[in-house]
């Protein structure tokens, strides 16, 4: 698994709802703290 | 890995009330909202509210305002869904749930649900 | 009217290809609103699939198979699952959701039953 880049991967709520969510995916960390990181290549975006 | 962990079946009397919990177990609750969503028997879900975990603020559906208090404890990650003046047809399982979208991906968490039964 | 109409049952055999429709009411446009897709079986809480607004505004559910899709169908004004390649342990119940009037609202859910 590679490591969580918490700079560069983004996260929006899930139950939130979209007016209030705004679809924006704010730059914080997932719900649970000691969860393990999406491991998706797609979902990691390298700071360049 | 994180499990949302509830507490166990009630059975309580109409005009009662009960106060479900859903603990974050291995893991701490963050800024993401917690959702209590219900399912009586043979019926789809319904969705009760949420709450963020991180600043304590509200959202109720309309069906519950007045009657449903959702709190957090983050001292021990635990949120709590209380539901007063309870009927017969409040009979269900209620569940907590949360979780997050990447761009390609969503990740939900729910818990095991809880059985709330109202009887005379 | 409810917000969310989905057909109470379907089935269909092992190895088709199967579409579940959310029919949003009218007067409620399917291109606004992005369809949250839940599966459920007996005794588990739901688990979410899926949501879909558009090829460019959709995510998939941590672990969920891509023969698991969403798209829409703008002349009904529906939400749809399509389930390809079925198997026995897709048989549940399949529910559509979105976020409406500052709510979510769920559909009253299909059982698929996989046949054989």
């Known amino acids: 698994m590679e490591d969580f880049n918490m700079e560069s991967d983004s996260f929006e709520d899930f139950w939130k709802g979209e007016d209030l969510s705004n679809y924006s995916y704010s730059s914080t960390l997932p719900p649970f703290l000691l969860d393990a990181a999406p491991c998706e290549p797609e979902s990691l975006e390298i700071n360049k | 890995q994180v499990q949302l962990v509830q507490s166990g079946a009630e059975v309580k009397k109409p005009g009662s009330s009960v106060k479900v919990s859903c603990k974050a177990s291995?893991?701490?609750?963050?800024?993401?909202?917690i959702s209590w969503v219900r399912q009586a028997p043979g019926q789809g879900p319904e969705w009760m509210g949420w709450i963020n975990p991180n600043s304590g603020g509200t959202n109720y559906a309309q069906k519950f305002q007045g009657r449903v208090t959702m709190t957090r404890d983050t001292s021990i990650s635990t949120a709590y869904m209380e539901l007063s003046r309870l009927r017969p047809d409040d009979t269900a399982v209620y569940y907590c749930a949360s979780g997050y979208c990447s761009r390609s991906r969503c990740y939900d968490y729910w818990g095991q649900g809880t059985l709330v039964t109202v009887s005379s | 009217q409810a917000v969310l109409t989905q057909p109470s049952s379907l089935s269909a055999s092992p190895g088709a290809s199967v579409s579940l429709t959310c029919t949003l009411r009218s007067g409620i446009n399917v291109g606004a609103y992005r369809i949250y897709w839940y599966q459920q079986k007996p005794g588990s809480p739901p688990q979410f699939l899926l949501r879909?607004?558009?090829?460019?505004?959709?995510?998939?559910g941590s672990g969920v198979p891509s023969r698991f899709s969403g798209s829409r169908d703008a002349s009904a004004n529906a939400g749809i699952l399509l389930i390809s390649g079925l198997r026995s342990e897709d048989e549940a119940d399949y529910y559509c959701a979105i976020w409406h009037s500052s709510a979510w609202v769920f559909g009253g859910g299909t059982q698929l039953t996989v046949l054989g």
């Open positions: 879909y607004k558009s090829d460019s505004d959709k995510q998939q």
């Open positions: 291995g893991g701490t609750l963050s800024s993401y909202a």
